[in-house]
Every structure is written in C-alpha cells, then in structure tokens.
C-alpha cells in the first residue's frame, strides 16, 4: 500500500490527521526530501558562527566561521581558534611550538621534525617552529646521479588525535574559550 | 535582498481571463514554495493558491478551485496565476509571497467589472 | 479548515501604552501561529512566527505567547509607527491557510 505521504514534496510535510494534504513548512523551518511528517527548524549561524548558505524551505542553512575561527565537526558544528604558524592550541589558548616540534599551518597540533638519521640521511636545513627540518644527503648518497636533497617523510595529517584534541564546550564561555559549538545541534520538529 | 514583483494586474469584464506574474529576486527561487494571497478593498487577507518548489504539488482555495491557475518557470524566476471565468468578488490586490509568509510582493489590483 | 478569530477588531490607543491583541484558533494549533503587520497600502510583514518567535529586524517591543488555542501579540511601548492592522495565521493544518480578520490599531 502507498504511503498516502509519499506525495509532498519538500517543502511541505504530510498532515497526518488529513492524508494527503502537504502542509507548506512554518516560517523559519524545512524538509529536504519528500514524505515528510515533520519540518525541521533551520539551524541559525550565530555569533562566531557565519552563514555560508541561507535556510529555505528545502534546505537547511550552512554556515561555516568568522575570521580568526575555523571549522570543526561535520558540518561545522564547531568553530576553533585559529592560531599562528609554529604554535598550537591549548586549554589555555595559542602556545608556541615546543623545541623539535613545528606547525606549518593556523590550526592543529605541533608535530615533531623529521628524524633524518632514521634515513640515514643529514640535516639540510635546520628546522623551526613553524617549519619541518630539510633532509639532506648523506655521504652514500653523493654518488652522480643521486638527488641531493630528500623531501622529509610526510607528516602525520593536521587535526587532532583523540588524546590531542582540546575540546572546550560552548558553556564554558570563560576567557580560555578557544572552541565554540552549536547551542542547537539537536533537532526540533514541526507537528 | 529578497524582492518579489507582481505585474498584470488589471480591469477586466466578469468572465474574461488574465494572467498575473511575480518576479523574484535576491534569493533562491527554485528552493521555495510559493504562495499568491488576495485582499479585496478594506478587507482582510485572503489565501489563494500554493505551488511546491518544484511546481509537483499545487493547492487552491475553494473559492477559486477549477478557475485559477498556479505555475512557475523556475529558470525565469517567476510565479503566474491564471485567472479564469472572473467574478466580481475576485476584485482584490494580489500578493505573491514565498512559502514561509516572510516576504511578498507589493500587490497589484485586479478589479473585475462590467 | 481552522477557523481564527481575534480580539478586538479594532483598538485606540496612544504612544507608550501597552497593547494587547489575542487570536483565537477553533482547534488546537500548538504553536504554528504567525502574526503580521500591514500598513495601509502596503504589503504584510511577519513579525512573530511559532507564537513566540521574533522575525529577524522586527523591535523587540513586540512579543507572542500562547499555545493550543489562545494567542495573544503584545507591543510593549507604542510608537507612532505601530499604527496598523494586525492579523493572525495558522500554519498547523494547511491548506487552506487561514488568516484572523484583522485588529485595526488606531491612535486615541
């Protein structure tokens, strides 16, 4: 038997007390697919939040960070404190990279400098807080024809690790506040 | 910003037909319903018609069921309704307006008359 | 199709009063009632959405409560620009959406 809701489209849910009547969303609300029983309300991009993408009524609304923030979490549920180059962020906010670690980016941990020797390789260019160190050939490698200068292994991906990343919940809006999420991620329904 | 133009309004003799149009501006129109509402001189609102997004789903007032008509063309940005068999109690100001009754047009007066 | 009465039809009153105007819906309608503002000659603009709810722009003077059946606006402190005619709507069970007859707000 065919759902007599399969009908609405988005845009609309299915009045369940009259079977076939698709009701347009209230103001302010959406179904992205049809056969809906509900419309959902829009998620609203506020404070360091930004709208990317403005709610209709089949659609929600996208929103990514202000400036100085970046996103977090699927869909952007959490915007993070940007931090220079060649630090990384703490509980207690922007910290420089500890001596033998470096941050090539504005967000994410410090990650150690290439081990060159592991290679057997010789450090080229010493490495900083905000750079990895160069390799450079060891004695074996002078041979003609060898690359003199070896990129160092990649890094591990930026972002956090379970143990590394610093949560901080959006309740906790203290000056230590570096990560903010949204008050309204849970859904709310129409009807 | 949002902006919705209605146009061909007009005077017209009880049972000729005429075809209204709503241009919209500064939103996504193919992303929502929209809606045409009527107000006849010094009375309230009255709905009229809905068409989905996609122009799949349409819904009329008993008043106008079998004689109006909704359609879109969502490449030009437009609404229209098709009025047919005109009467004199069809004299209103007609609104366009996006599905949610956030924004509408400025109205334009069809007024039927012999 | 639900049926909305509001309360009074028309109302004088001056700049600064509080202003209560109530709608009442045949059925229950939760909280799926919107209010507009129309001045003459002009188009209605949402001002309360889901009974409470403000639209983005309109003065926070303006408030909605009520649930169920009973709903009333409230405009805390008039200002001259307030003179208007109010409407209720549901957006429970529709179509037909249906539209409260109007409150015509008037100065004393």
């Known amino acids: 038997l065919q759902d007599p809701c399969s009908n609405c489209p988005a845009g609309t849910f299915c009045d369940n007390n009259r079977n076939q009547i698709c009701s347009p969303c209230p103001p302010n609300s959406f179904s992205s697919a049809g056969g809906q029983r509900t419309c959902d309300i829009c998620r609203q991009c506020k404070g360091v939040f930004r709208t990317r993408k403005e709610c209709s009524s089949t659609s929600n609304a996208e929103c990514d960070c202000t400036p100085g923030f970046h996103c977090l979490g699927a869909g952007c549920s959490m915007c993070e404190q940007d931090c220079k180059q060649g630090q990384e962020l703490t509980k207690k906010g922007c910290k420089d990279c500890c001596f033998g670690t470096f941050n090539d980016q504005k967000r994410g941990i410090c990650r150690p400098w290439t081990n060159c020797s592991l290679d057997g390789k010789s450090v080229l260019v010493n490495g900083t807080k905000e750079r990895d160190v160069v390799c450079g050939p060891s004695p074996a490698d002078l041979s003609p024809g060898a690359s003199s200068v070896t990129p160092p292994a990649p890094a591990r991906e930026p972002g956090h690790s379970p143990q590394e990343q610093k949560l901080i919940s959006e309740e906790d809006l203290g000056g230590e506040q570096k990560l903010i999420s949204e008050e309204d991620l849970h859904h709310h329904h129409h009807h | 910003q949002v902006q919705l133009v209605e146009s061909g309004g007009d005077v017209v003799q009880p049972g000729r037909s005429l075809r209204l149009s709503c241009t919209a501006s500064g939103f996504t129109f193919s992303s929502f319903g929209m809606h045409w509402v009527r107000q006849a001189p010094g009375k309230g609102l009255e709905w009229v018609t809905f068409?989905?997004?996609?122009?799949?789903?349409?819904y009329y007032a008993d008043s106008v069921k079998g004689r109006f008509t909704i359609s879109r063309d969502n490449s030009k940005n437009t609404l229209y309704l098709q009025m047919n068999s005109l009467r004199a109690e069809d004299t209103a100001i007609f609104y366009c307006?996006?599905?949610?009754?956030?924004?509408w047009g400025q109205g334009t007066l069809v007024t039927v008359s012999s | 199709d639900i049926q909305m009465t509001q309360s009074p039809s028309s109302l004088s009153a001056s700049v600064g009063d509080r202003v209560t105007i109530t709608c009442r819906a045949s059925q229950s309608i939760s909280s799926y009632l919107n209010w507009y503002q129309q001045k003459p000659g002009k188009a209605p603009k949402l001002l309360i959405y889901?009974?409470?709810s403000l639209q983005s722009g309109v003065p926070s003077r303006f408030s909605g409560s009520g649930s169920g059946t009973d709903f009333t606006l409230t405009i805390s402190s008039l200002q001259p620009e307030d003179f208007a005619t109010y409407y209720c709507?549901?957006?429970?069970?529709?179509?037909?959406?249906?539209f409260g007859q109007g409150t015509r707000l008037e100065i004393k």
């Open positions: 307006a996006r599905d949610w009754l956030d924004y």
């Open positions: 068409l989905s997004y996609d122009g799949s789903y349409k």
């Open positions: 889901a009974a409470s």
């Open positions: 709507q549901q957006s429970y069970s529709t179509p037909p959406i249906t």
